[in-house]
Amino acid sequence: FSPLRRISIKILVHSLFSMLIMCTILTNCIFMTMNNPPDWTKNVEYTFTGIYTFESLVKILARGFCVGEFTFLRDPWNWLDFVVIVFAYLTEFVNLGNVSALRTFRVLRALKTISVIPGLKTIVGALIQSVKKLSDVMILTVFCLSVFALIGLQLFMGNLKHKCFRNSLENNETLESIMNTLESEEDFRKYFYYLEGSKDALLCGFSTDSGQCPEGYTCVKIGRNPDYGYTSFDTFSWAFLALFRLMTQDYWENLYQQTLRAAGKTYMIFFVVVIFLGSFYLINLILAVVAMAYEEQNQ
């Protein structure tokens, strides 16, 4: 080993070196939180970049750059350090027009804390392992969601466009002429029935067990879907989103009530199956896999 490499190894394994880097990262994070940093912080930024460059140089000299098993770039944690330094120099010395987007990468410096604190490194390692193990469960989840999304698509396509329409029109008005002129919220409120405080027209259906319209209104299929058009089963992607919403139980009771009002109460069976399978079984299966991965990592 050359004298330079010996010195680099000594520095690298010294506890003070680790302490210096940890303090630098934490101080850097504090400086990043400043709203309107004074001009002198620019020099501090250069100091931080200098320390990170010194750290990487020490590691490269001690371990080698990329040829060999234990070299600098063979450790994924060092990729992060390398990216941080590259972006630090890029944003400082290269004129790339919209630098603000690149300056966002400065936040990656905070992630350097993980590689310095051993406990944190273990937890993140476990997290990555759990994600690897989750791949099979994720495939199963996506498959189940896709199957139910296709069923939902067949059962409820277009149903959430059913609305209660006013039974009195001007002489020159027909359903189609109104459909072609509906634009503003005011237009919708003129022709459709709204429950007090509701932002969407009252849903209805054509089957006997679906929601019925009040007197003076008739059920028609016109206009957009509820919730600004985001709630529907009209395409596979929207149906998939609706199913994901059921699985995560994100205000799912509203989707359930809307669909049952438009399609009929019989379809509650669909929701019972989806909630039991998707929400109770698959979510807990995911949690079980994550728990197992942490357990394995700890052992």
Epitope: M157, L169, E176, S177, E215, T218, V220
Partner: nanobody, 124 residues
Framework: EVQLVESGGGVVQPGGSLRLSCAAS?????????TGWYRQAPGKQRELVAR???????QYADSAKGRFTISRDNAKKTVYLQMNSLRPEDTALYYC?????????????????WGQGTLVTVSS
């Protein structure tokens, strides 16, 4: 293809009567907002004569008030237009319009569905 079957048109003398029928007997017709009669005289635009909403309330053009009566038979899915005291200016092609929802088998579709038209000629 959705079809409305119109009948009852013909030649009648001024002051005479005619009864037009519009049958939406196909199972495709689910629910209407209204079913109405429109007419189009040669060289003129199509205009409303009378219409009946699904709850039974009616609406007439000024020219039809007091002379024409629109009614419906829900069991037969048929709408009638009883035309009395006919005048030469009533000569036109009379169209039936189902404005509501149909079923295509796969989904529901709302819109305007017109008949082929039946000719009414009032002349002496």
């Amino acid at each position: 293809e959705v079809q409305l079957v119109e009948s009852g048109g013909g030649v009648v003398q001024p002051g005479g009567s005619l009864r037009l029928s519009c049958a939406a007997s196909s199972r495709q017709f689910i629910r209407d907002v209204f079913t109405g009669w429109y007419r189009q005289a040669p060289g003129k635009q199509r205009e409303l004569v009378a219409r009946i909403y699904n709850e039974g309330n009616t609406q007439y053009a000024d020219s039809a008030k007091g002379r024409f009566t629109i009614s419906r038979d829900n069991a037969k899915k048929t709408v009638y237009l009883q035309m009395n005291s006919l005048r030469p200016e009533d000569t036109a092609l009379y169209y039936c319009l189902f404005s509501g929802t149909i079923s295509t088998g796969r989904e529901y579709r709302s819109g305007d569905y017109w008949g082929q038209g039946t000719l009414v000629t009032v002349s002496s």
